[in-house]
C-alpha cells in the first residue's frame, strides 16, 4: 500500500461533500490509534469501487453515519 | 476563487538555504493534502513533496530527502518547503498542487489545483 | 521503481484529428493511481484524467482515458485548437512516490 512505509495514516485529503447512501458499498470508520492521531472514515462507492476519505467534522458526514447506523439497526433482528 | 499562490524563490548560491511559501484561498485548505513539485528549464515535471491535510503524513522525492522539508499552517492557510543544501539540478520552477478532495492511499484523485509557480536558480 | 515511458514523444496533428496518447508503466500499476495532465508553455498544468478514466471537474468529453495494468492511454476525439500542449501521465504508489512520465507534445502538423 502507497506511503504504508512511513505512516499508517489513510487519509491525504478529506470531503464534506454529501454521499448518497443508495451509491455506497462500504462504510469504515477507524479509530484514532498509536498509528494515526485521529478518526477517519472511508467510503468506498459502487461506481468503480472509488474510496474517498470524509470528514468527520462535516454535519453532511455525521448525518450519513446516522443514516447509515439506522438502516444497520433496522435489519438487524 | 479558488487559489495557490507561491513565493519566495530567487537565485541562491550552492550549499545554501531557501523557504518557499504557498499561500491558498477559495477552498478550505485544512481539507487538502498538498504537494510541491517542480519543473527544470526545458524538462519535465517531477514530483517533490506531499503532505496530508492534517500534517500527519509526509513523503519526499529520493531526490531531496533530508535536505527538503515540506510543513503547513492550516491557521494560515499556507504550505512551505524548506530547501536545505542546495545544488545547481535544484533549479527549477516549484509548484505548490493540490490533492484532489478525499484521496487516501486507496484512491488517487490527482493534483487539481495548481499555483503559477515559482523560480528558484541556484548558481554561484 | 516505477518507470513511466509514454509515446510518441511529439505526436504532429491537424485540428479536428483524434489523438492517441501512451503511457507504459515498468510494472503493473494499479488504475485507481492514474492520472493524466495537460500543460500548456509558461503554464501551470492542469489535471485531465483520474483513476486512468474519470475526467476532472471542467475537462470537456472529448478527452478520456483508458487502460490498465501497464499500458494506459489517453485519446483526445477530435483535436481543438486549444489543446497543442504538452501531456504527462502520472502514477502514484511507489518509491518515489509520484511518478510522472517524461510527457507528450501533441503540435499542430
Known amino acids: 500500500i502507497p506511503l504504508s512505509r512511513t505512516v499508517r495514516c489513510t487519509c491525504i485529503s478529506i470531503s464534506n461533500q454529501p454521499v448518497n447512501p443508495r451509491s455506497l458499498e462500504k462504510l469504515e470508520i477507524i479509530p484514532p490509534s498509536q498509528f494515526c492521531p485521529h478518526v477517519e472514515i472511508i467510503a468506498t462507492m459502487k461506481k468503480k469501487g472509488e474510496k474517498r476519505c470524509l470528514n468527520p467534522e462535516s454535519k453532511a458526514i455525521k448525518n450519513l453515519l446516522k443514516a447509515v447506523s439506522k438502516e444497520r439497526s433496522k435489519r438487524s433482528p | 476563487q479558488v487559489q495557490l499562490v507561491e513565493s519566495g524563490g530567487g537565485v541562491v548560491q550552492p550549499g545554501r538555504s531557501l523557504r518557499l511559501s504557498c499561500t491558498a484561498s477559495?477552498?478550505?485548505?485544512?481539507?487538502?493534502?498538498m504537494h510541491w513539485v517542480r519543473q527544470a528549464p526545458g524538462k519535465g515535471l517531477e514530483w517533490v513533496a506531499v503532505?496530508?491535510?492534517?500534517?500527519?503524513?509526509?513523503s519526499y522525492a529520493d531526490s531531496v530527502k533530508g535536505r527538503f522539508t515540506i510543513s503547513r499552517d492550516n491557521s494560515k492557510n499556507t504550505l512551505y518547503l524548506q530547501m536545505n543544501s542546495l545544488r545547481a539540478e535544484d533549479t527549477a520552477v516549484y509548484y505548490c498542487?493540490?490533492?484532489?478532495?478525499?484521496?487516501?492511499?486507496?484512491?488517487?484523485?490527482?493534483?487539481?489545483?495548481w499555483g503559477q509557480g515559482t523560480t528558484v536558480t541556484v548558481s554561484s | 521503481e516505477i518507470v513511466l515511458t509514454q509515446s510518441p514523444g511529439t505526436l504532429s496533428l491537424s485540428p479536428g484529428e483524434r489523438a492517441t496518447l501512451s503511457c507504459r508503466a515498468s510494472?503493473?500499476?494499479?488504475?485507481?493511481?492514474l492520472a493524466w495532465y495537460q500543460q500548456k508553455p509558461g503554464q501551470a498544468p492542469r489535471l485531465l484524467i483520474y483513476?486512468?478514466?474519470s475526467r476532472a471537474t471542467g475537462i470537456p468529453d472529448r478527452f478520456s482515458g483508458s487502460g490498465s495494468g501497464t499500458d494506459f492511454t489517453l485519446t483526445i476525439s477530435r483535436l481543438e485548437p486549444e489543446d497543442f500542449a504538452v501531456y504527462y501521465c502520472?502514477?502514484?504508489?511507489?518509491?518515489?512516490?509520484?511518478?510522472f512520465g517524461p510527457g507528450t507534445k501533441v503540435d499542430i502538423k
Open positions: 498542487a493540490r490533492e484532489g478532495e478525499g484521496s487516501n492511499i486507496y484512491f488517487y484523485y490527482g493534483m487539481d489545483v
Open positions: 477559495g477552498f478550505t485548505f485544512s481539507k487538502h493534502g
Open positions: 503532505i496530508g491535510f492534517a500534517g500527519v503524513i509526509k
Open positions: 510494472q503493473s500499476v494499479s488504475s485507481s493511481y
Open positions: 483513476g486512468a478514466s
Open positions: 502520472q502514477q502514484y504508489g511507489s518509491s518515489p512516490i509520484f511518478t
